[in-house]
């Protein structure tokens, strides 16, 4: 058993059929020493009396709020929650894996640039009595300062029969260098509270890794004489990191129509303009990605082709 | 400790041609590592990111360009001092900072190619001769450290007496493979922000 | 399976011109750009120029630019390259390619051999 | 029009052994360079686009790199199957243009 906060501990449980459980002493948080009881959460049934309690968790329903009480006054709380640990691997019963870029990855966390800002986000489908709480550092045997945010919910999805909902966080580490050379990785934690049971769910990466620029701006066309020929200009997005001439993008200049399986015309280049061929009902699109360091493509910027 | 934006032509640049090639290579390298060791840990996740050219050289802090001179938590510099004339200046206004810098980039390279040589001697006797380092790569740091052009003593290669753990020595080209990338992406970072200015 | 059928090989007076089909199967034609490749004997590739079947477009290679005609009809699944004004240097194997991408070619006809000769 | 030469133009290799091709750009094409494979009396056959991008149905051991105004085809071991002429070509602007291609010959 461990404190989560004040007055909340977490149970760690081998979870399997007749499994023993915990053994758990609560102690009231009190100078009294005669008189107190205890009772567990809305219940008037009283469990045991004196200042300490001894249980025997095996299940969600030994799990809850222990109040102990003298003369119909409250003494204090003690919340347990249940952390599960099935076949020696531990519950993620209450995220989704959302199974992007591998299996069994219930957090997923990008930045815009190398400001040392960056963005979690998880799914689930559960949309009542959950909590979650974010915390994260650089490194993990000498931690160095992350800052994180309340997490909150972002977006709602219909998926089939289920609603999916989905929380993010931002984070800022406290004294980031854009041109360092990252040797620790970022450590985000997330724990996951939904009713009794407790949650954690981690990921480690480095901010070079989960770039994604946002998408190029300011596109313009620009049709040239007596050709099919368009030159098709952008910027870089405000939110990238600055100078430009150090951290250099570079572009996909696509044109296509509205479905993925039509023709296309495709050129890279590391210029802010390119001449590509326009169709009619097409539309020309431009994404972008570190010059150097090949993390993700930011989404497309596009403009219809007439 | 930064770069002014007092610098040479595009023009009279050669080191950013040869910078890109460096990238290049050592990426194509690192990706042939990762392939041929599959069942060695050699991905970003598993290997412990070393810095072989920690506290010897200080080439992000004195490549540094001038816009993030006032970014506080880029400037805990670590003194290193370097000998100044290479041949990528090309210009007589090239200024101290500048010439710091791409010496310090020069360091790091004869820092790695020192290592680079002396892992490929031991993987060289490899019975089971499963990989090696790529002629190229070390061709190109050569080309690099030729049109960087600084002279400083040689270090001599590092020779080992003792039998080679070729399990070790591959785990650590896997290391030192990921370091030099995340170098060589600050090099060549540097040099378009030269070949700019 | 995508397949470029072309015409048979032809012989040319200089001065003249010729006409090379290339029947396409697999696929709708209109879905991809269809391009035109030359080889002289014992040379490399040389690029004429390109069509979308599905509105007519073409662009051309500067040069052979006024001299070479590209056009398709949907109807039959069929372009065809037309080249005027045909000299010597101009005996060639000559490739129709197609690909959904318009700017290099992810399959090939199998030739047709043009031979310009008094 | 974009300049593209290939080196060498011939290069004998004994089975088994790589083989490396050099395709240089006359100005920068960024990645917009793909590799092809003839063999006499066929038509050429798609190895890579994009510099790097492997097609499916080609056997791994044909590779690409490069970006800017140098690239490479790596054959890591050469079949002798691959005894054959291999040419680069630019997409970066029209006209589109070609390598003068590199002989691939038995040592």
């Known amino acids: 058993i461990w404190e989560l906060k004040k007055d909340v501990y977490v149970v760690e449980l081998d979870w399997y059929p007749d499994a023993p459980g915990e053994m758990v002493v609560l102690t009231c948080d009190t100078p009294e020493e005669d008189g107190i009881t205890w009772t567990l959460d809305q219940s008037s049934e009283v469990l045991g009396s004196g200042k300490t309690l001894t249980i025997q968790v095996k299940e969600f329903g030994d799990a809850g709020q222990y109040t102990c009480h003298k003369g119909g006054e409250v003494l204090s709380h003690s919340l347990l929650l249940l952390h599960k640990k099935e076949d020696g691997i531990w519950s993620t019963d209450i995220l989704k894996d959302q199974k992007e870029p591998k299996n069994k990855t219930f957090l997923r966390c990008e930045a815009k640039n190398y400001s040392g800002r960056f963005t979690c986000w998880w799914l689930t489908t559960i949309s009542t009595d959950l909590t979650f709480s974010v915390k994260s550092s650089r490194g993990s045997s000498d931690p160095q300062g992350v800052t994180c945010g309340a997490a909150t919910l972002s977006a709602e999805r219909v998926r089939g029969d289920n609603k999916e909902y989905e929380y993010s966080v931002e984070c800022q580490e406290d004294s980031a260098c854009p041109a360092a050379e990252e040797s620790l990785p970022i450590e985000v934690m997330v724990d996951a509270v939904h009713k009794l049971k407790y949650e954690n769910y981690t990921s480690s990466f480095f901010i070079r890794d989960i770039i994604k620029p946002d998408p190029p701006k300011n596109l313009q066309l620009k049709p040239l004489k007596n050709s099919r020929q368009v030159e098709v200009s952008w910027e870089y997005p405000d939110t990238w990191s600055t100078p430009h001439s150090y951290f250099s993008l570079t572009f996909c200049v696509q044109v296509q129509g509205k479905s993925k399986r039509e023709k296309k015309d495709r050129v890279f280049t590391d210029k802010t303009s390119a001449t590509v061929i326009c169709r009619k009902n097409a539309s020309i699109s431009v994404r972008a990605q570190d010059r150097y360091y090949s993390s993700s493509w930011s989404e497309w910027a596009s403009v219809p082709c007439s | 400790r930064n770069l002014p934006v007092a610098t040479p032509d595009p023009g009279m640049f050669p080191c950013l041609h040869h910078s890109q090639n460096l990238l290049r290579a050592v990426s194509n390298m690192l990706q042939k590592a990762r392939q041929t060791l599959e069942f060695y840990p050699c991905t970003s996740e598993e290997i412990d990111h070393e810095d072989i050219t920690k506290d010897k050289t200080s080439t992000v802090e004195a490549c540094l360009p001038l816009e993030l001179t006032k970014n506080e938590s880029c400037l805990n510099s670590r003194e290193t001092s370097f000998i100044t004339n290479g041949s990528c200046l090309a210009s007589r206004k090239t200024s101290f900072m500048m010439a710091l810098c791409l010496s310090s980039i020069y360091e790091d390279l004869k820092m790695y190619q020192v290592e680079f040589k002396t892992m490929n001697a031991k993987l060289l006797m490899d019975p089971k001769r499963q990989i090696f380092l790529d002629q190229n790569m070390l061709a190109v740091i050569d080309e690099l450290m030729q049109a960087l052009n600084f002279n400083s003593e040689t270090v001599p290669q590092k020779s080992s007496l003792e039998e080679p753990d070729f399990y070790k020595t591959k785990i650590k080209l896997c290391i030192l493979l990921h370091a030099f990338r995340i170098r060589a992406v600050t090099i060549d970072r540097v040099m378009s922000y030269l070949n700019a200015s | 399976q995508v397949q470029l059928v072309q015409s048979g090989a032809e012989v040319k007076k200089p001065g003249s011109s010729v006409k090379v089909s290339c029947k396409a199967s697999g696929g709708t034609f209109s879905d991809y750009y269809l391009h035109w490749v030359r080889q002289a004997p014992g040379q490399g590739l040389e690029w004429m120029g390109w069509i979308d079947p599905e509105n007519g477009d073409t662009e051309y290679a500067p040069k052979f630019q006024g001299r070479v005609t590209i056009t398709a009809d949907e109807s039959t699944s069929t372009a065809y390259m037309e080249l005027s004004s045909l000299r010597s240097e101009d005996t060639a194997v000559y490739y129709c390619?197609?690909?959904?991408?318009?700017?290099?070619?992810?399959?090939l006809g199998q030739g047709t051999l043009v031979t310009v000769s008094s | 029009d974009i300049v593209m030469t290939q080196s060498p133009l011939s290069l004998p290799v004994t089975p088994g052994e790589p083989a490396s091709i050099s395709c240089r750009a006359s100005q920068s094409i960024s990645i917009n360079l793909h590799w092809y494979q003839q063999k006499p009396g066929q038509a050429p056959r798609q190895l890579i686009a994009?510099?790097?991008q492997s097609i499916s149905g080609v056997p791994s051991r044909f590779s690409g790199s490069g970006s800017g105004t140098d690239f490479t085809l790596t054959i890591s071991s050469l079949q002798p199957e691959d005894f054959a002429t291999y040419y680069c070509?630019?997409?970066?602007?029209?006209?589109?243009?070609f390598g003068q291609g590199t002989k691939v010959e038995i040592k």
């Open positions: 390619a197609r690909n959904k991408e318009l700017r290099y070619f992810d399959v």
């Open positions: 070509q630019q997409s970066n602007s029209f006209p589109l243009t």
């Open positions: 994009f510099a790097s």
